[in-house]
């Protein structure tokens, strides 16, 4: 057995093709009948299929055939259009011929689908050549549902693909109307249109009137390289047909609407864009629209027409910019359900949607963001950010104009500078301390809502974690303990794992803030403390000398400290400790550790003139749990 | 200029060991807490130890507890991670970090390779 023939067989995408004695063609030495010259199919085709010109062209793969039906064309492989525009595509038939007694013989048949080649049943080169039925006088748009070359593209590998383009060259323009290109005409000084405009929708035909003789325009398309370079690659001459249709007495055809979009207390015209429709028997003025259900956005008026709402207008009122819509209502979508009719066909549904914009808008800011301390961390809330116009707009949309200085704002765990409100009300969007040298930070925003901005500026406050206790009044002139009933950072110590440290500010305004000696023995007196740490409130080293209110009547009154504790891995924190101070009263039981009482209530009891602790706190009417501190 | 500089980085085998050291200029590390933080290729940051220079309390990660120790000299304003029994996971960009009243400053880091 001897196999002659080409063995490839070149074919029209999507078509059928027989094989031929010149692709395919067994004989034997013995002269076989081409009945018995017998293939069997031991890998079908990938990209269509083979099957016999006399049976059921839809049923199973054909697996055996002759010789005898190659010669008479009965063989036939039938490719398939995939989804995805290819130029040139190959595909290979894997067969076994056999003629008992002699050997089997194995042959491979190559398939070429390609555009390339002249097909008769398929006239153009191009993925889509279609052409485009027109209504009389009216416009169409030529989409690529009807031309597109990006076949051509496919010819390109894909990762240049993006740097090309198709070009079309019109070589003979329409004679009954006229090619637009972004709304501007093609001419002969500018006789070109790209694949990406006819993709993009930009490519318009507008038929000029005057009978409904066919149209069309002949073309040059070939590859685009980058900036416009022109390159090597597939390339075709074609035309393109445009069939003109009669439209008298049909039925007008209502086009698609675009909503109309204004602003709350503003007044705009209703144009084509909201309310068209295709009727070349009609005249304008004759095509009636009623109002059968208004919304409560605002209403139609009419320009001269008086101030009052309207319910019946022309598509001529609309055409000549007289209808208009007044938003005197809230600023929501609203639709106007219309009736409309030429007068001879039977009235048509169609709406009108109305989006009412707001006119301003107001970021909402009612409280800074408190991050606790241990955590350095905080999810934003509505607390923080909340967009309001005449109503909350829950879909507002927030950037990041300037940022924090001492830290990021992070969704999902990433750093961002865009977000929805939806994200803030899930509680998605969180400000993380990553700088720990300020207890507060703030970041700007502008909110984006319904086409309006408006910016803010979100505060961020670190809060203590520090008990603070100050119990009862304090007695002035005395020197009481400050250890941890008071001031307590143990919490933040053990989540730390570090010691944490104090500094004063600010106050106290009638007093001080000192450092006591450790033992009677120790030498010299009291040390004013600027700053101090956790381990030296629980060795009980410190102690606040309260002063009295100076200039007046002796009495209680009030003051505070005002204290920045930070510890290791956490921002730091401002907090306060207010308390009351009353003149020292000796038969009371102060909440406190005295260090020392008022030397005068000291030479009155007869008390020797030192400064011994008066011991631990007297007894208490009761005992509240320490609160927590307010960061500052 | 406020600085911090990590020096003693390398290559060394796997079991071997390296000194790595943090020095201060321009503000007193006495009154501040120290961290090292390193970054390995295509992963996360991971503060491998941190010490309180007052009170000399230490932290270290899971990773490195017994291997390595942190430690402050604050007469030559430094502080230091010895690293002992280093491992290949332990490879990484290592970084230290100052953290006290109102500063909080990062040196360049200093590179770790440990491999065969």
């Known amino acids: 057995l001897s196999l002659k023939g080409s063995q490839t067989l070149t074919v029209c995408p999507g078509s059928v093709q027989p094989l031929s004695s010149q692709t395919l063609r067994a004989s034997s030495s013995a002269g076989t009948d081409p009945q018995l010259l017998l293939y069997r199919v031991v890998r079908g085709p990938q990209l269509g299929r083979l099957f016999h010109a006399q049976q059921d062209s839809t049923g199973e793969a054909l697996v055996n055939f002759t010789q005898a039906e190659v010669y008479a064309g009965n063989i036939l492989y039938e490719h398939e259009m995939p989804p995805e525009p290819f130029w040139e595509a190959h595909d290979t038939l894997e067969l076994q011929l056999s003629s008992p007694p002699a050997r089997d013989v194995a042959a491979t048949l190559a398939v070429a689908v390609s555009f390339e080649a002249a097909c008769p049943q398929r006239p153009s080169h191009l993925w889509k050549n279609k052409g485009l039925w027109v209504p009389e006088g009216q416009r169409a748009r030529i989409t690529v549902a009807a031309l597109d070359a990006s076949n051509l593209l496919a010819s390109v590998p894909s990762p240049q693909r993006s740097e090309h383009d198709v070009l079309f060259q019109v070589t003979q323009f329409p004679s009954r109307g006229q090619l637009l290109v972004s709304e501007e005409p093609l001419h002969a000084g500018q006789p070109h249109f790209l694949q990406s405009q006819l993709a993009a929708g930009q490519l318009v035909y507008a038929h000029g009137g005057g009978g409904t003789q066919q149209d069309g325009f002949h073309f040059r398309a070939h590859l685009q390289g980058p900036a416009g370079a022109s390159v090597a690659g597939p390339q075709t001459s074609e035309a393109f047909a445009i069939t003109v249709r009669d439209v008298n007495e049909r039925p007008p055809q209502p086009q698609a609407s675009v909503p109309l979009r204004l602003t709350r207390g503003s007044r705009a015209p209703i144009s084509r864009a909201q309310l068209s429709v295709v009727d070349p028997d009609s005249a304008p003025g004759e095509i009636e629209y009623e109002v059968q259900r208004a919304p409560h956005n605002g209403f139609l008026s009419l320009v001269g027409g008086g101030l009052g709402p309207v319910t019946r207008f022309t598509q001529a009122d609309v055409d000549s910019g007289r209808l208009a819509f007044v938003a005197n209502g809230s600023s929501v979508a609203g639709i106007f359900q219309l009736s409309m009719s030429d007068g001879a066909s039977p009235p048509l549904p169609m709406s009108l949607a109305v989006d009412i914009l707001p006119s301003a808008i107001e970021v909402q800011l009612r409280a800074p963001l408190e991050v606790p301390q241990a955590l350095g961390r905080s999810s934003l809330s509505q607390q923080q950010l909340r967009v309001v116009s005449d109503r909350e707009e829950p879909e507002a949309a927030y950037r990041l104009i300037q940022g924090p200085q001492y830290g990021h704002l992070l969704v999902g765990g990433r750093p961002t500078s865009a977000f929805s409100q939806f994200q803030i009300d899930q509680g998605e969007v969180v400000f993380a301390f990553t700088n720990f040298s300020s207890s507060h930070d703030h970041f700007r925003v502008l909110a984006l809502a319904r086409g309006v901005n408006a910016s803010a500026v979100v505060n961020v406050t670190v809060r203590a974690l520090l008990h603070v206790w100050a119990g009862g009044p304090w007695p002035q002139g005395a020197t009481l303990r400050l250890d941890p009933t008071v001031l307590d950072a143990g919490e933040l110590a053990n989540r730390t794992g570090s010691v944490p440290r104090f500094r004063l500010l600010e106050g106290p305004r009638h007093g001080r803030v000192v450092r006591v000696p450790r033992a009677r023995t120790e030498p010299g007196g009291s040390q004013l403390v600027e700053q101090f740490t956790q381990q030296d409130l629980e060795d009980g080293r410190l102690g606040l000398e309260v002063g009295r209110p100076e200039g007046r009547a002796p009495g209680p009154a009030g003051d505070s400290l005002t204290l920045e504790l930070w510890a290791q891995g956490v921002p730091p924190a401002v907090a306060s400790l207010d308390f009351a101070t009353e003149p020292y009263n000796a038969a009371r039981p102060y909440s406190v550790a005295l260090l020392s009482v008022p030397e005068a209530a000291r030479t009155e009891a007869g008390k020797p003139e030192s400064s011994t602790p008066t011991g631990e706190p007297g007894p208490m009417a009761s005992s509240p749990e320490p609160a927590v501190a307010k960061g500052g | 200029e406020v600085q911090l500089v990590e020096s003693g980085g390398g290559l060394v085998q796997p079991g071997g060991s390296l000194r790595l050291s943090c020095a201060a200029s321009s503000f007193n590390i006495k009154d501040t807490y120290i961290g090292w933080v390193r970054r390995a290729p295509g992963k996360g940051t991971e503060l491998v130890a941190s010490?309180?220079?007052?009170?000399?309390?230490?932290r270290y990660a899971d990773s490195v507890k017994g291997r390595f120790t942190i430690s402050c000299d604050t007469s030559k304003n430094t502080a230091y991670l010895q690293m002992n029994s280093l491992r290949a996971e332990d490879t990484a960009v290592y970084y230290c970090a100052a953290q006290g009243y109102r500063l909080h400053y990062w040196g360049q880091g200093t590179t770790v390779t440990v491999s065969s």
């Open positions: 010490i309180d220079c007052i009170y000399g309390y230490t």
